[in-house]
């Protein structure tokens, strides 16, 4: 069996994990991807997912989790913003591709996020402030995409997350430091 | 259409084990979670546990640790639910239910399998 | 574990009027980075098997009429019946999925007054 592999990130509350899960271009670009959470003794949880089939850097936002699938560059980025201590555990990035099991993106991140210090606006004049805009969508994201019969003849499918939001768009405003995962070395 | 089809009642005597089958089909058997509750008569539900038919791993409810077992056949599409060292208070409807992935609640059911425990 | 609670234990409803039934939890089921509540709402007639009619506290299953609805966020949830119709009659499970084992309320009767 594959050993699974770790990568851990710790941050601050208030900072945003940003991860780029890369992936092989050519097989994966159009497949839907997802962010999952897994808790020991427990199946990995889908907690964000892009749409079907994937859109070419077009964000999808789930809560504080973004998800951008870059299929130039073979990456999905996943940024979970304002973070929270309860966000702190193993996450994995997936694509779904069904009939077979997801395919996992290695590495698996390890997120600590604790309390303290996290350079928020006016709490250091030095500190910068970041304002993410993202469009808004009224797409369905659709996890899984693992389509029956009921799914593909009766609207509206199954399972489906709204993912509109509810401005034109999304400011971040407690957002100091992005943390960067290195894809192409 | 999804359909979970599941074995006959049974009749054991305590100290026995039971092996319950859920056949799916009309969806892709290996995408899905699928879990297993149970129901006393005239009670409420209790989750059992859960098996993912693609690579087979399962996680089980504290209580039925040691005494439950689930499987599947991806050949047939069938899940199996055992449990040994069937004792009075195991009587109950058993069913399979399939899992959203997003959204984890159970949107398909079987019809139930009755277990009577009884010396 | 987390102990799902719900009132009332029965309730007796006339036709057409609202029915509520409520559920709390003994811990939040909200995950704060998708703000999704883990609850759903189950409807069990007589020798049938549960029927999903909510997810996410408020995602309203397909084919599930719209007089049902689902509220609420973190420990506490409502399910809502506007307008009782005769095949209303069932008892409703709350079922929280946040964490396992998965667990269920101690189900609502719902009969016609």
């Known amino acids: 069996a594959t050993k699974l592999t770790e990568e851990k990130y710790e941050l601050k509350e208030g900072q945003t994990l940003d991860v780029k899960c890369d992936y092989t271009l050519e097989k994966f670009a159009s497949s839907q991807k997802a962010w999952q959470i897994i808790r020991d003794g427990e199946m990995p949880k889908t907690l964000a997912c892009t749409e079907r089939p994937s859109k070419n850097s077009h964000p999808v936002q789930v809560g504080r989790i973004i998800l951008e699938d870059y299929h130039d560059h073979g990456l999905l980025r996943v940024r979970m913003v304002n973070l929270q201590v309860e966000d702190s555990g193993l996450y994995q990035c997936v694509i779904y591709q069904p009939p077979k099991e997801p395919h996992m993106l290695f590495d698996r991140i390890r997120l600590v996020v604790t309390k303290g210090f996290s350079g928020t606006p006016g709490s250091n004049e030095n500190s910068t402030q970041n304002v993410y805009k993202i469009p808004p969508t009224t797409t369905k994201a659709l996890c899984p995409l693992y389509t029956s019969p009921r799914t593909v003849t009766q609207a509206p499918p199954k399972s489906t997350a709204d993912v509109s939001t509810p401005d034109s768009e999304i400011n971040l405003t407690n957002v100091t430091d992005i943390i960067r995962v290195p894809v192409f070395n | 259409q999804v359909q979970l089809v599941q074995s006959g009642a049974e009749v054991k005597k305590p100290g026995a084990s039971v092996k319950v089958s859920c056949k799916a089909s009309g969806y892709t058997f290996t995408s899905y979670y699928m879990h297993w509750v149970r129901q006393a008569p005239g009670q409420g539900l209790e989750w059992m546990g859960i098996?993912?038919?693609?690579?087979?791993?399962?996680s089980y409810a504290q209580k039925f640790q040691g005494r439950v077992t689930m499987t599947r056949d991806t050949s047939t599409s069938t899940v199996y639910m055992e449990l040994s060292s069937l004792r009075s208070e195991d009587t109950a409807v058993y069913y399979c239910?399939?899992?959203?992935?997003?959204?984890?609640?159970?949107?398909?059911w079987g019809q139930g399998t009755l277990v009577t425990v009884s010396s | 574990d987390i102990v799902m609670t719900q009132s009332p234990d029965s309730l007796a409803v006339s036709l057409g009027e609202r029915a509520t039934i409520n559920c709390k939890s003994s811990?939040?089921?909200?995950?704060?980075?998708?703000?999704?509540?883990?609850l759903a709402w189950y409807q069990q007639k007589p020798g049938q098997p549960p029927k999903l009619l909510i997810y996410w506290a408020s995602t309203r299953e397909s084919g599930v009429p719209d007089r049902f609805s689902g509220s609420g966020s973190g420990t506490d949830f409502t399910l809502t019946i506007s307008s009782l119709q005769a095949e209303d009659v069932a008892v409703y499970y709350c079922q929280q999925l946040a964490s396992y084992p998965y667990t269920f309320g101690g189900g609502t009767k719902v009969e016609i007054k």
């Open positions: 811990q939040s089921v909200l995950f704060s980075s998708n703000n999704k509540n883990y």
């Open positions: 239910a399939r899992g959203l992935i997003y959204g984890d609640a159970f949107d398909y």
């Open positions: 098996i993912n038919p693609s690579g087979g791993s399962t």
